[in-house]
C-alpha cells in the first residue's frame, strides 16, 4: 500500500467515484499509521486547500459538487524535517458523477457468458463525450478509461473484458466526460450484470406434468441438484429476462426450486442454472435444455406469473 520511504498513501472510501451530493473520506496513510496531514488539489498549484487546515486520520468531503472533482495529494506530518512535511503522496483522482445525461451500456455477444470467454462492453451516447469510464460495483480501484470514438453523431467506446473468471462477474456501469472537465462524469448508465456460467456442476430440469402438455394445462418446471445451490435461475430461449427462485432443501437431500409457468399457451426451450448467495453472478453449467411442447391451440406468448427479473439485479442477493 505504501509509496516510497517518505511518501504517504492517499486513498478514498467508499469509492473514488462519488455522486453529486455524496460524501467521501480522504485518508492519508503515512509511516504505518494515520498522522496529521495536509491536502492539496492539483489544479490549485499545490497550494494546500481548505485554508491550510491540518487533518487527522481522514478528511470528509461533502456534499460533493462538480468543483470537488480533480486530483488530490496529501503530505504527512514530519516534525523533524526541514519543511515539517513529507513528500507529496500518490495522486488520487476523485470523480464526481451526475453532471451529464447518462450513456447506454451494452454487452456483446451478451451478458451471459462462459468462463474463459471475452465480452465487449460498449458504452455509447448522443452526448459528445471525450472519455468513457467503466466501473464495476463494489471495487475500489479507479474505473477503466477509454477515449470516445465519434461516428454518425454518436460517441462510443468498447471495453474488452476477459478472459472471464469469477472475479470479473458483477454489476457494471459506465460514465462519460466532456472535454475540459475530465473528472466531472455523467450520470451512470443503467446497470448491466455480467454473469459467468460453467463453474459448477449442472442442475437437472424437469417438467410437471411432463414436457408435452395440452393448451391451458398448468405447467411447473423443477430445477434440482445435489449441490447446495442457494438460487436457481430459469431462462427461456429468445427471452432476455430470467426468473429466479430460492432453492429449497428436499428430503432426498437435493436442492430444488419449482417455477410455476401457469396455464400452457406456448412452448419453448428452457434451461436452468444454480448459483450461491456469496457469488450471485457466478452460475453453474446450464442444465440440459428442456423443450416444452404445447398441443392444441397455442397463443403467441406464455404468461409470466413469476415476476421476471429486470436486465439488472441478477447480481443482487435474493432476500
Amino acid at each position: 500500500l505504501m509509496g516510497g520511504q517518505d511518501k504517504p498513501f492517499l486513498s478514498a472510501r467508499p469509492s473514488t467515484v462519488v455522486p453529486r451530493g455524496g460524501h467521501v473520506a480522504l485518508q492519508c496513510h503515512y509511516r504505518r499509521g494515520f498522522n496529521n496531514f495536509m491536502l492539496y488539489k492539483e489544479d490549485r498549484s499545490h497550494v494546500p486547500i481548505f485554508h491550510g487546515r491540518i487533518f487527522q486520520e481522514s478528511f470528509i468531503m461533502g456534499p460533493v459538487t462538480p468543483a470537488h472533482a480533480g486530483t488530490y495529494r496529501c503530505r504527512g506530518s514530519r516534525p523533524h524535517s526541514l519543511t515539517g512535511w513529507s513528500a507529496p503522496s500518490n495522486p488520487l483522482v476523485i470523480m464526481v458523477t451526475g453532471n451529464h445525461r447518462k450513456p447506454s451500456l451494452l454487452a456483446h455477444p451478451g451478458p451471459l457468458l462462459k468462463s474463459g470467454e471475452t465480452v465487449i462492453l460498449q458504452c455509447w451516447s448522443d452526448v459528445m463525450f471525450e472519455h468513457f469510464f467503466l466501473h464495476r460495483e463494489g471495487i475500489s480501484e479507479d474505473p477503466s478509461r477509454l477515449v470516445g470514438q465519434i461516428h454518425d453523431g454518436v460517441s462510443k467506446a468498447n471495453f474488452s473484458i476477459g478472459p472471464l473468471m469469477p472475479v470479473l462477474a458483477g454489476t457494471y456501469r459506465c460514465y462519460g466526460s466532456v472535454p475540459h472537465s475530465p473528472y466531472q462524469l455523467s450520470a451512470p448508465s443503467d446497470p448491466l450484470d455480467i454473469v459467468i456460467t460453467g463453474l459448477y456442476e449442472k442442475p437437472s430440469l424437469s417438467a410437471q406434468p411432463g414436457p408435452t402438455v395440452q393448451a391451458g394445462e398448468n405447467v411447473t418446471l423443477s430445477c434440482s441438484s445435489w449441490s447446495s445451490y442457494d438460487i436457481y435461475h430459469l431462462s427461456r430461449e429468445g427471452e432476455a429476462h430470467e426468473r429466479r427462485l430460492r432453492a429449497v432443501p428436499k428430503v432426498n437431500r437435493t436442492f430444488q426450486a419449482d417455477f410455476p409457468l401457469g396455464p400452457a399457451t406456448h412452448g419453448g426451450t428452457y434451461r436452468c442454472f444454480g448459483s450461491f448467495r456469496a457469488l450471485p453472478c457466478v452460475w453453474s453449467n446450464s442444465s440440459d435444455p428442456l423443450l416444452v411442447s404445447v398441443t392444441g391451440n397455442p397463443s403467441s406468448s406464455w404468461p409470466s406469473p413469476t415476476e421476471p427479473s429486470s436486465k439488472s439485479g441478477i447480481c443482487r442477493h435474493l432476500h
Partner: antibody
Framework: QVQLVQSGAELARPGASVKVSCKAS????????MHWVRQAPGQGLEWIGY????????ENNRKFKDKTTLTADKSTSTAYMELSSLRSEDTAVYYC?????????????WGQGTTVTVSS | DIQMTQSPSSLSASVGDRVTITCRAS??????LAWYQQKQGKAPQLLVY???NLADGVPSRFSGSGSGTQYTLTINSLQPEDFATYYC?????????FGGGTKLEIK
C-alpha cells in the same frame, strides 16, 4: 441547543409566490448545509434541494428546479426558500433540515414545518 | 436517480410485538441511509443514521441493519409511543430520495 425555527403558515393565490424562512441557532450556520423537504397532504417526504450557506452553492431536485429558489443570509443565520408560480398541487408542509457531519450524515435537526396552502 | 422501495406500506401490530421494516435501494448506497419516525402533524425525527447507528436519545429497542442495497429497521417490544409513520432516506448522491413510508398502526 440546535434549533431551526420556520416562519408561519402561508395562504397564497394560484400564480403568486411565497418565501419561507428557517432561522438557525445553536451552531455555526455556515458549517452545515441546509436542506428543504416537502410533504403534500397525506403523502410522503420529498427532498427539494439544499444550500451551502458558506458558499451560496445550491442544488435542486430536478422536479422542483423551476419552482424553488434557495438563498441564505449569513448575517442572520437564516435560510430561505421561495416558491413561485404557485398551483394547488404546491399545497404542502415545507420543512428545513440540517445535514449533519461525518461520512454518512443524516438530517439531524428539522424545523417545525411551514404549511403553504394555495387556493383561489 | 436512486429509488428507495420501502415495505410494507402499512403494518398492524400490538404493544410488545417485534416489527421489521425494510428498505431496498435501486443501487448500492454504501450504508448512506437514515431512518426517521414521524408522528401526525409533527416534523420527522431521526432514529438511525449510517444504516446501523442509533441517534442520541433513541431507545435501544430500535435497531438498524443492512448494507449495499438492502436495509432493515427493527423495533423490539413495541411501545404505545412507537405507533407512527417511518421513512428511510438515502444520502448517496442527490436527489436524496425517501422511501414511501410505513404506517405502523395498533392492531
Amino acid at each position: 441547543q440546535v434549533q431551526l425555527v420556520q416562519s408561519g403558515a402561508e395562504l397564497a393565490r394560484p400564480g403568486a409566490s411565497v418565501k419561507v424562512s428557517c432561522k438557525a441557532s445553536g451552531y455555526t450556520f455556515t458549517s452545515y448545509t441546509m436542506h428543504w423537504v416537502r410533504q403534500a397532504p397525506g403523502q410522503g417526504l420529498e427532498w427539494i434541494g439544499y444550500i451551502n450557506p458558506s458558499s451560496g452553492y445550491t442544488e435542486n431536485n430536478r422536479k422542483f428546479k423551476d419552482k424553488t429558489t434557495l438563498t441564505a443570509d449569513k448575517s442572520t443565520s437564516t435560510a430561505y426558500m421561495e416558491l413561485s408560480s404557485l398551483r394547488s398541487e404546491d399545497t404542502a408542509v415545507y420543512y428545513c433540515a440540517r445535514l449533519g457531519k461525518g461520512l454518512l450524515p443524516p438530517f439531524d435537526y428539522w424545523g417545525q414545518g411551514t404549511t403553504v396552502t394555495v387556493s383561489s | 436517480d436512486i429509488q428507495m422501495t420501502q415495505s410494507p406500506s402499512s403494518l398492524s401490530a400490538s404493544v410488545g410485538d417485534r416489527v421489521t421494516i425494510t428498505c431496498r435501494a435501486s443501487e448500492n448506497i454504501y450504508s448512506n441511509l437514515a431512518w426517521y419516525q414521524q408522528k401526525q402533524g409533527k416534523a420527522p425525527q431521526l432514529l438511525v443514521y449510517a444504516a446501523t447507528n442509533l441517534a442520541d436519545g433513541v431507545p435501544s429497542r430500535f435497531s438498524g441493519s443492512g448494507s449495499g442495497t438492502q436495509y432493515t429497521l427493527t423495533i423490539n417490544s413495541l411501545q404505545p409511543e412507537d405507533f407512527a409513520t417511518y421513512y428511510c432516506q438515502h444520502f448517496w448522491g442527490t436527489p436524496y430520495t425517501f422511501g414511501g413510508g410505513t404506517k405502523l398502526e395498533i392492531k
